[in-house]
Structure formats: structure tokens, C-alpha cells
């Protein structure tokens, strides 16, 4: 068997460090027979059996000019091996960060913090940690570990599936290459790093007779898990065309109706989301959606406001890809103290 | 010699933008992470933000979130700092530096300053 | 964020005295301390590195310890070129954290 230990990477190569001294092994002898070693093409002896070392090749103080191929032959001229020395650096600890979109899963990824210039895999893994207790302050050994899956084709992510809301959770990601291995530790809730996607299928509407109103409606992002215990607030943000600051409000419920929009102009409408208990960050905006004011006149008759309303209070259903979150506060009215002068100024 | 240069300090009024550049030289800047850090008058160091050398992450002080921009380009082995929406707390030496391992700064730039005042 | 806490925030000392600085940080840090030597009007200096290494270049006079929460830099014979503000610095994170310094001046 091989004197020489295998490190991992791919076979035949071994590895140094720049500016260090670096030991190269003869593969193909018995450990500590003396061999003779020559760079791959040159005739000159670079150390002979004499040396004192065996079966091993010292280059102090190794730099790029050494990287190459490496022959070394036994006393009768035998070829004993070829090495392929490659040098880099020790890997340093890699940069991680955790994310979640739902409040059942999250995902973690990592970059190095420095290039090693070697194979380079890692290794992930997380461990729940569980509290002893009423002390919040004292924890029990973490249950775990357990691997943190990664995506396939190289991504640099993993996925913890099925996480608990309330735990908290200590990200391991270890970078390896062949001169060691270095462990970024990163402990996670999914209640800090929790920000859902943008809600999704925004539409502006405007409301027939009323040119100082727009319906904006939206639902739930699809990558909320359609339960009625997590549920979603919402901002809303609406300008008209070529005003540059925006107006925000919080929506009772998944639409909103504006009703200081400039008559005559295309409004833009965003919408971010987040946890209704405040957990976590806001989502990205949504793209905008634009509409544009009505510019007809008043219906005739105009409805009594329950008949008005599309969207009835109904409990969140388990099926429904966007379950409605039970209002907080009543619906926006769509006509209120306002529509007089809204309908003097239709009318005039 | 292996050095960090950098460029881009002066006067501005708050709210004002500034760019901040890092030259980097002697080292192969796309290898590492990089980070600014800051001193104002008188005072101690503060982190301000780092990013890793593919640019693909990036971390910023709570101080400055939201208002700071890191970036690099590797082809120019320049590091950037954008800084928007600047206030009087801002006013400081802003120092590039290479760090090993993400935070153990082995090599510094010289600075360049900063002041925010009407 | 992990605070650091410097002491004492300035010493004065004689050439030749043994000089002792601490850093504590509000939660285990392992062993990811660094210290830093600031002269005026200059870049800070990488000193110590791992809360006991020895920077490449750096006298042998300077020396630091400690391990979690809790740790020590030493100037075993202060010299009259070490006056300088010293920093330590946590990276346990990826947010890292200096202390407020401690200024050093001879007697």
C-alpha cells in the first residue's frame, strides 16, 4: 500500500501552501525507501537517494514556480510515482446567511470569505436547539445534527424542510479542501429572518363614477402555506405617473380602495407583506400594477355600501391558494364622508 | 508591494451621495473578501460593511444599512463604498481593508475622510 | 452585536514597565480576537490575531491571551515607540466589533 495519504481531491494530487515548506510523497514505494525526484521533463535531479528523507521530496519556502508534475524513481530506476503538486491556502470560514419565505422552511447560503484556490467542498448540517424549561436561559444539549440538504448542480444552498416556527436552529457550514477544513456557525429563527415573497396577482381597477378612486385587490404570495394560524399584513404604496414620492397605507384585508387618487392620471400600486404579528421584514414590493381613475359619471343609483363590497368575510379555507386574513377592523368604506364633494365636483 | 489605496473623500451636504474607491495592488484582490471601516474624529473603529470576493454576499453595520452600498470589481481589483443620503454622524476617516477569514484584518489603506456638513 | 468593552481606556507607564490591557466581549467569542496598535494620524496595525497569534513582523515584546468572554494583551517591556491606542477587535460574527480602545503614553 501507499506511504502517501490521500487527500481529498482528485487522485495523484498533492498540496502545499505558498511561502511554506511542503513535503511531496512518493506514492509507488514502501515508506522510507529511498527515491530520486525530477520535475516532468527535466533531466536535473532535484533530490537524490542519499538525502536522508526517504521516500518524501522538501521544497522550502514553496511558491507557483514549484506547482507542476513531480517523477520519483527507486534505486534501480523504477518509476515510483508521478505527483502533481498544487498550492493554495487553508479554507477560511465561509459567509452564511439563512432566509425564509414561509414559516415552515428556510434556506441558508454561503460564499467563501476567502479563495483557497484548491477543491473546495462543504459540508452542511444543522441542530435544533430546545429550551430547558421555564428558564429560557438554560438550554439542553441541542437535538441533532442533521444534514442540511443542498440543492443539486452546485448551488451554493441547503434547506431545512419542515422547521418549527419557534425553535431556534445553529447552521453548521464547513468548508473543506485539502489542507483542512473551517466551520462557519450561524444560530437562526425562523421568527428574525422570516420575510414572505410579494403578493402576488395585484390589479388596479377604477370605480365607475368616482374619479378620485382606485380598487387595488391582491392575493396571497403562492409560497405561503395555506393555513389560517400564519397569517399576512399588508402595505400598500400608490403615486401618480411622474410624482416621485409615494403614499403608503396598511389594507385591512387583501384589497384597498384609494381614494385621493389625481383624476385623469395613471396611478402606479406596489404591495409588500408581512407577518401579521410583525415577525421578521416586509417583503420586496410587488411590480407595480397601474390603473387609471374613472372618468364617467355617477350611476344613477348608487348601491348601498354592503352591496358594493366584493369581498365577503369569509373564514380562511384551507384548499384556498390565498386565504383571506379575518379583518382586524372593518372593511374600507367605498363611500364615506367624503363621496359628497367626490359627487358635487362629478356633477358640476 | 501589495497595498490598498483609497479615493473619493471630501465635503458633501447631508442627504448628499458620495462614492468611495479602493485600489487594490501586490495580492490577488478577487481571492478575498473586503471591508470598509470607519474612524470619526477623535474616536474609535467602526465596521461599515463587507462583501466576499464574488461579491455575492454582502454585510453593512446597522448604522448604515439601507443607505450604504458595497461592491468590487474584480477586473479593476477595486473596491467600492456608495453612501447615500449621508448625515453629520457619517463625518469620518474611511479605511479599506483585506481581511483574512472575513474579520482579521491583515492590511489597511491609508484612509481617505469624509465630511458631512452644511 | 456582540459589544466589547476595553480596560482601563488609557494607561500611562514607564519605558521598560509591563503594560496589561483587558477585553471582555458580551457573549463567547471563542477565540476570534484580534488586537490592533493605531498610532495618530495612521491605519490601525494587526498585532495579535486568534487572541494569542503572533502577527508576522510584530516584536515579540506584545503577547495576548484569553479564551470565550475574557481576554489579555500584554507589552512585556514597553518601549517608547509602542505609544499608541490599542483595539481589540471580535470576528466571531459576521458583524465584526471593536472596542473603544485603550491609549497608551509614557511617563
Known amino acids: 500500500s501507499s506511504p502517501c495519504p490521500q487527500a481529498w481531491g482528485p487522485p495523484g494530487v498533492q498540496y502545499g501552501q505558498p511561502g511554506r515548506s511542503v513535503k511531496l510523497c512518493c506514492p509507488g514505494v514502501t515508506a522510507g525507501d529511498p527515491v530520486s525526484w525530477f520535475r516532468d521533463g527535466e533531466p536535473k535531479l532535484l533530490q537524490g537517494p542519499d538525502s536522508g528523507l526517504g521516500h518524501e521530496l522538501v521544497l522550502a519556502q514553496a511558491d507557483s514556480t514549484d506547482e507542476g508534475t513531480y517523477i520519483c524513481q527507486t534505486l534501480d530506476g523504477a518509476l515510483g510515482g508521478t505527483v502533481t503538486l498544487q498550492l493554495g491556502y487553508p479554507p477560511a470560514r465561509p459567509v452564511v446567511s439563512c432566509q425564509a419565505a414561509d414559516y415552515e422552511n428556510f434556506s441558508c447560503t454561503w460564499s467563501p470569505s476567502q479563495i483557497s484556490g484548491l477543491p473546495t467542498r462543504y459540508l452542511t448540517s444543522y441542530r435544533k436547539k430546545t429550551v430547558l424549561g421555564a428558564d429560557s436561559q438554560r438550554r439542553s444539549p441541542s437535538t441533532g445534527p442533521w444534514p442540511c440538504p443542498q440543492d443539486p448542480l452546485g448551488a451554493a444552498r441547503c434547506v431545512v424542510h419542515g422547521a418549527e416556527f419557534w425553535s431556534q436552529y445553529r447552521i453548521n457550514v464547513t468548508e473543506v479542501n485539502p489542507l483542512g477544513a473551517s466551520t462557519r456557525l450561524l444560530d437562526v429563527s425562523l421568527q428574525s429572518i422570516l420575510r414572505p415573497d410579494p403578493p402576488q396577482g395585484l390589479r388596479v381597477e377604477s370605480v365607475p363614477g368616482y374619479p378620485r378612486r382606485l380598487r387595488a385587490s391582491w392575493t396571497y404570495p403562492a409560497s405561503w402555506p395555506c393555513q389560517p394560524h400564519f397569517l399576512l399584513k399588508f402595505r400598500l404604496q400608490y403615486r401618480p405617473a411622474q410624482h416621485p414620492a409615494w403614499s403608503t397605507v396598511e389594507p385591512a384585508g387583501l384589497e384597498e380602495v384609494i381614494t385621493d387618487a389625481v383624476a385623469g392620471l395613471p396611478h402606479a400600486v406596489r404591495v409588500s407583506a408581512r407577518d401579521f404579528l410583525d415577525a421578521g421584514t416586509w417583503s420586496t414590493w410587488s411590480p407595480e400594477a397601474w390603473g387609471t381613475p374613472s372618468t364617467g359619471t355617477i350611476p344613477k343609483e348608487i348601491p348601498a355600501w354592503g352591496q358594493l363590497h366584493t369581498q365577503p368575510e369569509v373564514e380562511p379555507q384551507v384548499d384556498s391558494p390565498a386565504p383571506p386574513r379575518p379583518s382586524l377592523q372593518p372593511h374600507p368604506r367605498l363611500l364615506d364622508h367624503r363621496d359628497s364633494v367626490e359627487q358635487v365636483a362629478v356633477l358640476a | 508591494e501589495v497595498q490598498l489605496l483609497e479615493s473619493g473623500g471630501g465635503l458633501v451636504q447631508p442627504g448628499g451621495s458620495l462614492r468611495l474607491s479602493c485600489a487594490a495592488s501586490?495580492?490577488?484582490?478577487?481571492?478575498?473578501?473586503m471591508t470598509w471601516v470607519r474612524q470619526a474624529p477623535g474616536k474609535g473603529l467602526e465596521w461599515v460593511s463587507s462583501?466576499?470576493?464574488?461579491?455575492?454576499?454582502?454585510q453593512y453595520a446597522d448604522s448604515v444599512k439601507g443607505r450604504f452600498t458595497i461592491s468590487r470589481d474584480n477586473s479593476k481589483n477595486t473596491l467600492y463604498l456608495q453612501m447615500n443620503s449621508l448625515r453629520a454622524e457619517d463625518t469620518a476617516v474611511y479605511y479599506c481593508a483585506k481581511p483574512e477569514d472575513w474579520g482579521m484584518f491583515d492590511l489597511w489603506g491609508r484612509g481617505t475622510l469624509v465630511t458631512v456638513s452644511s | 452585536d456582540i459589544q466589547m468593552t476595553q480596560s482601563p481606556s488609557s494607561l500611562s507607564a514607564s519605558v521598560g514597565d509591563r503594560v496589561t490591557i483587558t477585553c471582555q466581549a458580551s457573549q463567547d467569542i471563542n477565540n476570534y480576537l484580534n488586537w490592533y496598535q493605531q498610532k495618530p494620524g495612521k491605519a490601525p496595525k494587526l498585532l495579535i490575531y486568534d487572541a494569542s497569534n503572533l502577527q508576522t513582523g510584530v516584536p515579540s515584546r506584545f503577547s495576548g491571551s484569553g479564551s470565550g468572554t475574557d481576554f489579555t494583551f500584554t507589552i512585556s517591556s514597553l518601549q517608547p515607540e509602542d505609544i499608541a491606542t490599542y483595539y481589540c477587535?471580535?470576528?466571531?460574527?459576521?458583524?465584526?466589533?471593536f472596542g473603544p480602545g485603550t491609549k497608551v503614553d509614557i511617563k
Open positions: 462583501i466576499v470576493p464574488s461579491g455575492g454576499h454582502t
Open positions: 501586490g495580492f490577488t484582490f478577487s481571492w478575498y473578501s
Open positions: 477587535q471580535q470576528y466571531d460574527n459576521l458583524s465584526p466589533t
